[in-house]
């Protein structure tokens, strides 16, 4: 009775448990009773990252500069190329197939987390006591100026988009 299962580094074909090809190699021919599985290394710019019985290696990912991509890690015969985005841009997906410009935080919002090559800017509304008067991908919310510490008084209240305006204290005549 032929086998119905094989060990993990083997595959079942023609009632034989044949050795899988190791990462970085592709299948040329299946084993027989008397001949071993034949495997060949992947070519330049190709890879296979698992024990396999693939007859073709996968092409390394191309980091297209026209899409704002650049190589973060060069591929090997066992690993794919890893792309990332040019400065100021981030990936649109986990696979990083294209890039978009980092979002800026509008006035009234500050940067909670600066963007990376794989994540966009995270903005947060400026809470009471803080403001942002610029559209920026880097600027946090700034605290209102403390008029008191300058021996001044608030002449105009601050908002989430504007700082307080300080002025001299009224002198008693």
């Amino acid at each position: 009775e032929p086998p119905t299962a094989c060990r993990e580094k083997q595959y079942l074909i023609n009632s034989q448990c044949c050795s899988l090809c190791q990462p970085g190699q592709k299948l040329v021919s299946d084993c027989t009773e008397f001949t071993e599985t034949e495997c060949l290394p992947c070519g330049e710019s190709e890879f296979l990252d698992t024990w396999n019985r693939e007859t073709h290696c996968h092409q390394h990912k191309y980091c297209d500069p026209n899409l704002g991509l650049r190589v973060q890690q060069k591929g090997t015969s066992e690993t794919d190329t890893i792309c990332t985005c040019e400065e100021g841009w981030h990936c649109t997906s986990e696979a990083c197939e294209s890039c978009v410009l980092h979002r800026s935080c509008s006035p009234g919002f500050g940067v909670k987390q600066i963007a990376t090559g794989v994540s966009d800017t995270i903005c947060e509304p400026c809470p009471v006591g803080f403001f942002s008067n610029v559209s920026s991908a880097f600027e946090k919310c700034h605290p209102w100026t403390s008029c008191e510490t300058k021996d001044l008084v608030v002449q105009q209240a601050g908002t989430n988009k504007t700082d307080v305006v300080c002025g001299p204290q009224d002198r008693l005549r």
């Epitope: 086998p3 119905t4 094989c6 993990e8 448990c17 050795s19 009773e33 599985t37």
Partner: antibody, heavy 127, light 107 residues
Framework: EVQLLESGGGLVRPGGSLRLSCAAS????????MNWVRQAPGKGLEWVSY????????DYADSVKGRFTVSRDNSKNLLYLQMNSLRAEDTAVYYC????????????????????WGQGTMVTVSS | DIQLTQSPSSLTASVGDRVTITCRSS??????LAWYQQKPGKPPKLLIY???SLEGGVPSRFSGSGSGTDFTLTISSLQPEDFATYYC?????????FGQGTKLEIK
């Protein structure tokens, strides 16, 4: 130190049940395929069962198929052999053994062998 | 199922002798064969895997050869600690099977 330690053996009546355990230490148990092999008194080695690293694939010798069940708990580093409907001919020392896959980067196919064995636990089936 | 037949079943030899044990498979198993040594009251010990590769820590006086259906284990110069029982095992497909063993005794 890489070690396997079997337990759970003993005297059992024909038709009875027993559960053997094999505690693994000194290596990443969940990455290895495992086997049970037995040896009747004064006799040779007999492969009993196989289990893949995840527990997804199992296989058995014809002599125990339908009566024995192999399982594993990778979180506890334990291998089990549940033995039901025991017969006198199941009397043996039961060993757990680690499957290892040897390969090099030359591209030549790798090879399996059982490189680590426990000391064994004796199972006696008698009335 | 694949049957493995070892010969001889028992063998008497002296320290320093060259000894060869053979293992024949009922069907082709390429090089999916391992050899083990077992001493009384002890578990088996892996000597050779892939028909001819020496397991780490095993003395170089042990060697394996063969492919397909015919395999041999050779001990080039017997040492006192080599007197034991030797088994071949096929790991080509399930069910995995062992040869019946060869008992190597001191003359």
């Amino acid at each position: 130190e890489v070690q396997l330690l079997e337990s759970g053996g003993g005297l059992v009546r024909p038709g009875g049940s027993l559960r053997l355990s094999c505690a693994a230490s000194g290596f990443t148990f969940g990455s290895y395929e495992m086997n049970w092999v037995r040896q009747a008194p004064g006799k040779g080695l007999e492969w009993v069962s196989y289990i893949s690293s995840s527990g997804e694939t199992t296989d058995y010798a014809d002599s125990v198929k339908g009566r024995f069940t192999v399982s594993r708990d990778n979180s506890k580093n334990l291998l089990y052999l549940q033995m039901n409907s025991l017969r006198a001919e199941d009397t043996a020392v039961y060993y757990c053994a680690r499957d290892v896959f040897f390969f090099d980067s030359s591209g030549s196919p790798g090879a399996y062998g059982m490189d680590v064995w426990g000391q064994g636990t004796m199972v006696t089936v008698s009335s | 199922d694949i049957q493995l037949t070892q010969s001889p079943s028992s063998l008497t030899a002296s320290v320093g002798d060259r000894v060869t044990i053979t293992c024949r498979s009922s069907q082709g198993i390429r090089s999916s064969l391992a050899w083990y040594q077992q001493k009384p009251g002890k578990p088996p010990k892996l000597l050779i895997y892939g028909a001819s590769s020496l397991e780490g820590g095993v003395p170089s006086r042990f060697s394996g050869s063969g492919s397909g259906t015919d395999f041999t284990l050779t001990i080039s110069s017997l040492q006192p600690e080599d007197f034991a029982t030797y088994y071949c095992q096929q790991l080509n497909s399930f069910p995995s099977t062992f040869g019946q063993g060869t008992k190597l005794e001191i003359k």
